[in-house]
């Protein structure tokens, strides 16, 4: 009679995470008596999946019924699988032994390999926010996908990125794997709207992307553009004064007058009104009453947008015997001043 | 060559249930998905949802939940599309089309399309 | 769900003419635009992936152009074989979806 074999019919076998693999042994013929063992990974260090004999294996059920006399299927289901599991796994015969059962012979082996889906990307953007013309670094992350194979991109208002850097870890072999992609994006006055993408593709997913965003409006600064104007003489003595807060990003707006270097009054934006673009325009006035001044009146609009540091916006009122015809002061600069007589 | 082969026209009444299949060759069946697109006389296509060939999930349009569902017979590389208590409006032409994934999630290949019809 | 409108059902072209198909998504759809050509009684063929990537076996008269939400498909000189209904589709998000058709009929 021939000697027996140890038939493993799958070199490898592709398994989805959360699946049930099926290892497939059998068995040429019934002699010798003994049970049959399943290990994972070869040499002294291998590790017991299975012992037909003993144990409890709770993930681990058999494909024939191996209580039966004639029963040359050693075939077994692992359940609920996950990237750990990956490897070869050996379907081992012993022969009956006093006091314990020796090695006979093994099968040449299966390789499981899990395929696991990546988990959902997360894309952080920088701790502090950045003004228009600024390139800011986003970083997006996915873990636990197998195999390594995976496709990365980085969108931005409708544009596939091309300025980024992707790595995957680890390099050599692994049970599951890591993504990690830094995106440089260029900031615009437009982009309170807008969102940056990451999109992970893996043969998991087939027939949808992973994606994950951040929105720039968490991002970007957009600092205000101040202009004062003076309007019309309102009564005999009272001169109207406004500062235009224009094109800002976000809300937090604190804005202070001051008449010669003196505070006259301090004010938080609240009902602004909002443009196309995300960004805010918001109005002070400031009315003076130019008879309480012996002398020249310089007005100052101060304006702390989000902590930073403040800008501000200057106009002079000439307290003058002299009439001349009333303007505005649409200076461009942070500073400017615009000479102006009342009476 | 890759080639989606579904089987043939079917006639049904109203209330019946209806299977249609899907046959892929050529490629790994496994690796793509499989999406499936209906066509009413005369009108436009109609995306129904799409099935993953190696988890087995399935995703359905918001029109195509309820009497409809996706099955697979992975070993022999088909699938297949049933409809559950056929109405009339359910006379159409049916596609299954092959999936990409990695930047091209188009549907590249398809079937010839499996014509149902109901009527009482 | 992104609506993809295509603005012409149908078009009557002169064999040897220019003919363009436009395709606008109510959403952006980063480039993720396919076109489909369908003659009577057959299934789909895909043109163009990606709204400028012509499919392999395509006659290099048909190009795609386009990006954020519109889109367009060009056919540089009519052909009888061109008579057909094309589809623009979207696969940037699910549920896919597909545009109205536009059918080209000959004058």
């Known amino acids: 009679e021939e000697e027996l074999q140890v038939i493993q019919p799958d070199k490898s076998v592709l398994v989805a995470a959360g699946e049930t693999a099926t290892l497939r042994c059998t068995a040429t013929s019934l002699i010798p008596v003994g049970p049959i063992q399943w290990f994972r990974g070869a040499g002294p260090g291998r590790e017991l999946i299975y012992n037909q004999k003993e144990g409890h294996f709770p993930r681990v059920t058999t494909v024939s019924d191996l209580t039966k006399r004639n029963n040359m299927d050693f075939s077994i289901r692992i359940g609920n699988i996950t990237p750990a599991d990956a490897g070869t796994y050996y379907c081992v015969k012993f022969r009956k032994g006093s006091p314990d059962d020796v090695e006979f012979k093994s099968g040449a082996g299966t390789e499981l390999s899990v395929r696991a889906k990546p988990s959902a990307p997360v894309v952080s953007g920088p701790a502090a926010r950045a003004t228009p013309q600024h390139t800011v670094s986003f970083t997006c992350e996915s873990h636990g996908f197998s195999p390594r194979d995976i496709t990365l991109k980085w969108f931005k208002n409708g544009n596939e990125l091309s300025d980024f850097q992707t790595n995957v870890d680890p390099v050599g072999e692994s049970v599951s794997y890591s993504i990690h992609s830094t995106a440089k994006v260029v900031l615009t006055r437009e982009d309170v709207h807008s969102q940056v993408i990451c999109e992970v593709a893996h043969v998991t997913l087939q027939g949808d992307p992973l994606r994950g965003t951040a929105n720039l409006s968490e991002t970007i600064r957009v600092p205000p553009t101040l202009e004062v104007t003076q309007q019309p003489v309102r009564a005999e003595n009272q001169v109207n004064v406004t500062c235009q807060v224009r094109k800002f990003y976000p809300q937090r707006l604190q804005l202070t007058w001051l008449e010669n270097g003196n505070v006259s009054r301090t004010e938080t934006a609240s009902t602004v009104t909002e443009n196309k673009d995300g960004t805010y325009n918001w109005m002070s006035w400031l009315l003076v009453n130019v008879s309480a001044h012996r002398d020249d009146v310089k007005l100052t609009c101060q304006v702390e947008h989000d902590g930073q540091p403040a800008v501000s916006k200057s106009h002079d009122l000439k307290v003058s015997a002299h009439p001349k015809e009333q303007g505005s002061n649409t200076a461009a600069e942070n500073t400017g001043s615009n000479e102006r007589n009342i009476y | 060559q890759i080639q989606l082969v579904q089987s043939g026209p079917e006639l049904k009444k109203p209330g019946e249930t209806v299977k249609i299949s899907c046959k892929a060759s050529?490629?790994?069946?496994?690796?793509?998905?499989m999406h499936w697109v209906k066509q009413a006389p005369g009108k436009g296509l109609k995306w129904m949802g799409w099935?993953?060939?190696?988890?087995?999930?399935?995703t359905y349009a918001e029109d195509f939940k309820g009497r409809f569902a996706f099955f697979l017979e992975t070993s022999a590389s088909t699938a297949y599309l049933q409809i559950n208590n056929v109405k009339n409006e359910d006379t159409a032409t049916y596609f299954c089309?092959?999936?990409?994934?990695?930047?091209?999630?188009?549907?590249?290949?398809w079937g010839q399309g499996t014509s149902v019809i109901v009527s009482s | 769900d992104i609506q993809m409108t295509q603005s012409s059902s149908s078009f009557s072209v002169s064999l040897g003419d220019r003919v363009t198909i436009t395709c606008k998504a109510s959403?952006?759809?980063?480039?993720?635009l396919a076109w489909y050509q369908q003659k009577p009684g057959n299934a789909p063929r895909l043109l163009i992936s990606?709204?400028?990537s012509l499919e392999t076996g395509v006659p290099s008269r048909f190009s795609g152009s386009g990006s954020g939400k519109d889109y367009t498909l060009s056919i540089t000189s009519l052909q009888t074989e061109d008579v057909a209904t094309y589809y623009c589709?979207?696969?940037?998000?699910?549920?896919?979806?597909f545009g109205g058709g536009t059918k080209l009929e000959i004058k």
């Open positions: 089309a092959r999936g990409g994934y990695g930047s091209n999630y188009v549907m590249d290949y």
């Open positions: 050529g490629y790994t069946f496994t690796d793509y998905a």
């Open positions: 099935k993953n060939t190696e988890t087995g999930e399935s």
């Open positions: 959403e952006d759809i980063y480039n993720r």
């Open positions: 990606g709204a400028t």
């Open positions: 589709q979207q696969y940037w998000n699910s549920p896919r979806t």
